[in-house]
Amino acid sequence: MKVLQEPTCVSDYMSISTCEWKMNGPTNCSTELRLLYQLVFLLSEAHTCIPENNGGAGCVCHLLMDDVVSADNYTLDLWAGQQLLWKGSFKPSEHVKPRAPGNLTVHTNVSDTLLLTWSNPYPPDNYLYNHLTYAVNIWSENDPADFRIYNVTYLEPSLRIAASTLKSGISYRARVRAWAQCYNTTWSEWSPSTKWHNSYREPFEQH
């Protein structure tokens, strides 16, 4: 039994880091493998993660962490019974993938303006809470070419757009994702999408 693709890990910078790797053949990850991880610090504790299958030869493990600070560094040991298959380390602050925003809502009751709001996925006491910026993706269900991205570079989790920038009488979908420049994070996953019917009053034209 050998590791074909070494574990790579990302942290949500809150409580979970996710590590993925591939074995050289079909593996029952949860019965055959264990990933041990330990904070490199005084009187730290070794933890065991039981991996799950992620495709035939792929494994994924969700490492629980009480808290994360930028200096944290973890040792990782991948075991198959008594055999050490791989040894490495992981610094969560250098591999951050934020949690996805939630509760995306489209408010259409403001005249001719669409207000999109969503929730910051972090509690106020988390470092990333005040450092997230967002990308909002809006697309038409009827027209694949009608696809746009709005970058929200301010902290407020909301976006206002004129309803007239979209076609009237058509159903649209929106989703949102987040990243944090301070830790040069990857983008989060997209939030679940939300759907609405775009309709607005055409401006009255005088001839």
């Epitope: 904070l39 005084l42 504790e45 600070v69 200096a71």
Partner: antibody
Amino acid sequence: QVQLQQSGAELVKPGASVKMSCKASVNTFAGYNMHWVKQTPGQGLEWIGGLHPGNGDTSYNQKFKGKATLTADKSSNTAYMQLSSLTSEDSAVYYCALTTAGRAWFAYWGQGTLVTVSA
Amino acid sequence: DIQMIQSTSSLSASLGDRVTISCRASQDISNYLNWYQQKPDGTVKLLIYYTSRLHSGVPSRFSGSGSGTDYSLTISNLEQEDIATYFCQQGNTLPWTFGGGTKLEIK
């Protein structure tokens, strides 16, 4: 809410030993470290050392090696510190303080145990 | 051992004031700087850990900042219950060490 309950004040003679306790109201004592801190008017706060109750690992401030011995009873979530060969220099308030395992900040503190060394 | 210097041993301020307490380390402590509050009855509480992280249950008027060797604790709107002695502590290098404390009093 985590609470640490320390044993009561001690009046001891020079040369004697004293053992104080600190009981933690936590679910799994093994996930924490228990540290001890000395406070005197002259020296202020001094870190004595820490213990991982789960595996018994300890770390001591060199200054207190041979003076303090840290132990724990996992079954009762209680940590102990024994101080030996006491002198007047050991008269102080001793605090137990809890950290999450492997952390360098004392998240919860006991109320302190006053030790007075006097003939 | 790393020396932690709180150059101001006592400080007087009025209720509602913005108060800043400083702490200097004798060498770089890589943000492993924590702040504690000790009330007159001896009760000790963690306020800020790792330079700027607010411990759970601590009012948001407390904040921390700094890097390298220089760190500070700020109370943005002083309240009566904040009357206490404040200690800094480094957790970067063994043995962990504390500052001498800054006693905060009301004018």
